[in-house]
């Protein structure tokens, strides 16, 4: 059987359930509707996954029987629309049940909220979670799969499969351990972090599908499968970006069912035909399946093939390029970026896609020119300044993180970003620049060659949570104006903004500035949030405020907050030496 | 349309070198991936080695991989097969074929649209 090539199936629930086996089956239709209903109470929805559950062995029972012929937004929509307080918990959203198939799931779709208002998660006691975990581990782990999947609505849903599993293991393991929390609590911390990171990645993939279409997103996966592949010949990459492009419109188009049978098909092909894609692949194709694709998905780069010819000589010196490119634009330009993207893992992907652009936009001019060779001739030397730009950006910034450290290179990125678009909401702002500050620690410990993929691809990811952060509340045409022209200019769309000259600083308001107690107890991650929240709002109050300026009332805030935690009587300290500490501050910024 | 027509085979000794040939005409494009086949007696068609005349990449078996050579004149439309060091077991029939880029893998012959009359390798003592 080719992959995704199936043979038709009287029901499609029968055939998924079959094809990913009740567990997997059940998980991933929990996630789909806390994907789609996230305020949903748990239990509600474990009772409608139980309720499609069992629908689906009827029909794998008997295919003919009613409504099992039902496509699965038609079965998995009604469903939900049975839910009694749609209308009070999701207003308009109720909206999208008058709706018939395909159009009622688009509307499902549009409604995911990227932040939605759901109480922080926090962590219980070791002993409680495993008191819960050995008490009744299949509800452990549902709760833990629809608490993640109706906060981060766009979850690959096979990686979040991984991700339980993992998170059964640390359980599994450290309830048993002598210290439970030394063993627990780091892999929990990891599994967090991870899960933030991949979240934010799937993000982008599902942004740049939906905002930019299936061609933007093709592009982005012929960069990187080039990078990642460099031995594989272009049909090779061109069908797996083909395959990978089907898996992630589907899971971004709520269809996780299809996409995680579509996703272990994938691997599966890629492992059998291994020797024709990559020999980094061995130890991947090795593990079981979850594992398998999240090692594929990860895998380091491929040794770049020895003695690779000139590209010159192809895309540039030869008379038959136009007659190459009008032949079929695509295909032509898809070999360009292979080839570009498989000479250059030191190349970010969005670089890649600069270039490819340049190219793109240079041969549309030339090739309608009356001497197109001498028009296009010098196409390479307008990669210079596209490949030294972000070169540049990453020296100097990682400069000044080994200078400054993470802390105080968030800070620095505090004060740039809220200059650039005050308007962006204060939560939002602290969030995207301690991201965007991660890629310090991340990054600059890498030698040159891995630097530039490493960072700039990175801060792609971040700039979408911007993005899409923004879109649900729109107050900066800047940031509307950078998310939206060009999916690989955001970037350098977001440096190149200067201060927002037209913004009115936000009134001065002291309640703001006023802390309490509270404070002293917080963890230090927290303590650093409360504080670069105060820095985002001084910022807003004084935009024109200078670094030495702020730097000092930073200074003094700290040794502040450092001395009433110290002092028998903290909520008196924080009372009277916070009321001084603002008079100071309004003195010292001329507020 | 595409014409192919390979040259070159012939009768060696082991450890002798042969050089195939094979002229393409018609539309270029269709023939911008090229490759060579071979086929023993009994065996399944393989793939031996391709090249992309844009990018000019080539991709090799693993068994001839150090030993043959590809490349192309894409001035005569003609593309090549230096093959060294050759072995009894390097015994077949060469074809060339040529396909679409965005198609053609060397370990899928079905994925080469065009097709030569294929030339015979006799290596033996």
């Known amino acids: 059987r080719g992959v995704f090539r199936r043979d038709a199936h009287k029901s499609e629930v029968a055939h998924r359930f079959k094809d990913l086996g009740e567990e997997n089956f059940k998980a991933l239709v929990l996630i789909a509707f806390a994907q789609y209903l996230q305020q949903c109470p748990f239990e509600d929805h474990v009772k409608l996954v139980n309720e499609v559950t069992e629908f689906a062995k009827t029909c794998v029972a008997d295919e003919s029987a009613e409504n099992c012929d039902k496509s699965l937004h038609t079965l998995f929509g009604d469903k939900l629309c049975t839910v009694a307080t749609l209308r009070e918990t999701y207003g308009e959203m109720a909206d999208c049940c008058a709706k018939q198939e395909p159009e009622r799931n688009e509307c499902f779709l549009q409604h995911k909220d990227d932040n939605p208002n759901l109480p922080r998660l926090v962590r219980p006691e070791v002993d409680v979670m495993c008191t819960a975990f050995h008490d009744n581990e299949e509800t452990f782990l549902k709760k833990y799969l629809y608490e993640i999947a109706r906060r981060h609505p766009y979850f690959y849903a096979p990686e979040l499969l991984f991700f339980a599993k993992r998170y059964k293991a640390a359980f599994t393991e450290c309830c048993q351990a002598a210290d439970k929390a030394a063993c627990l609590l780091p892999k929990l911390d990891e599994l967090r972090d991870e899960g933030k990171a991949s979240s934010a990645k799937q993000r982008l993939k599902c942004a740049s599908l939906q905002k930019f279409g299936e061609r933007a997103f093709k592009a982005w996966a012929v960069a990187r499968l080039s990078q990642r592949f460099p031995k594989a010949e272009f049909a090779e990459v061109s069908k797996l970006v083909t395959d990978l492009t089907k898996v992630h419109t589907e899971c971004c188009h709520g269809d996780l069912l299809e996409c995680a049978d579509d996703r272990a098909d994938l691997a599966k092909y890629i492992c059998e035909n291994q020797d024709s894609i990559s020999s980094k692949l061995k130890e991947c194709c090795e593990k079981p399946l979850l594992e398998k694709s999240h090692c594929i998905a990860e895998v380091e780069n491929d040794e770049m093939p020895a003695d690779l010819p000139s590209l010159a000589a192809d895309f540039v010196e030869s008379k038959d390029v136009c007659k190459n490119y009008a032949e079929a634009k695509d295909v032509f330009l898809g070999m360009f970026l292979y080839e570009y993207a498989r000479r250059h893992p030191d190349y970010s992907v969005v670089l890649l896609l600069r270039l490819a652009k340049t190219y793109e936009t240079t041969l549309e001019k030339c090739c309608a020119a009356a001497d197109p060779h001498e028009c296009y001739a010098k196409v390479f030397d307008e990669f210079k300044p596209l490949v030294e730009e972000p070169q540049n950006l990453i020296k100097q910034n990682c400069e000044l993180f080994e200078q400054l450290g993470e802390y105080k290179f968030q800070n620095a990125l505090l004060v740039r970003y809220t200059k650039k678009v005050p308007q962006v909401s204060t939560p939002t702002l602290v969030e995207v620049s301690r991201n965007l500050g991660k890629v310090g620690s991340k990054c600059c410990k890498h030698p040159e060659a891995k630097r530039m993929p490493c960072a700039e691809d990175y801060l792609s990811v971040v700039l979408n949570q911007l993005c899409v952060l923004h879109e649900k509340t729109p107050v900066s045409d800047r940031v509307t104006k950078c998310c939206t022209e060009s999916l690989v200019n955001r970037r350098p769309c977001f440096s190149a903004l200067e201060v927002d000259e037209t913004y009115v600083p936000k009134e001065f308001n002291a309640e703001t500035f006023t802390f309490h107690a509270d404070i002293c107890t917080l963890s230090e991650k927290e303590r650093q949030i409360k504080k670069q929240t105060a820095l985002v709002e001084l910022v807003k109050h004084k935009p024109k405020a200078t670094k030495e300026q702020l730097k000092a009332v930073m200074d003094d805030f700290a040794a502040f907050v450092e001395k009433c935690c110290k002092a028998d009587d903290k909520e008196t300290c924080f009372a009277e030496e916070g009321k001084k500490l603002v008079a100071a501050s309004q003195a010292a910024l001329g507020l | 349309e595409v014409q192919l027509l390979e040259s070159g085979g012939g009768l060696v000794q082991p450890g002798g070198s042969l050089r195939l040939s094979c002229a393409a005409s018609g539309n270029t494009y269709l023939t911008s991936c090229m490759g060579w086949f071979r086929q023993a007696p009994g065996k399944e068609r393989e793939g031996v080695s391709s090249i992309y005349t844009v990018g000019g990449s080539t991709f090799y078996t693993n068994s001839v991989k150090g030993r043959f050579t590809i490349s192309r004149d894409n001035s005569k439309n003609t593309l090549y097969l230096q093959m060294n060091s050759l072995q009894p077991e390097d015994t077949a029939v060469y074809y060339c074929?040529?396909?679409?880029?965005?198609?053609?893998?060397?370990?899928?012959?079905?994925?080469?649209?065009?097709w030569g009359q294929g030339t015979l390798v006799t290596v033996s003592s």
């Open positions: 074929a040529a396909g679409s880029p965005a198609r053609c893998r060397l370990r899928d012959p079905t994925t080469f649209d065009y």
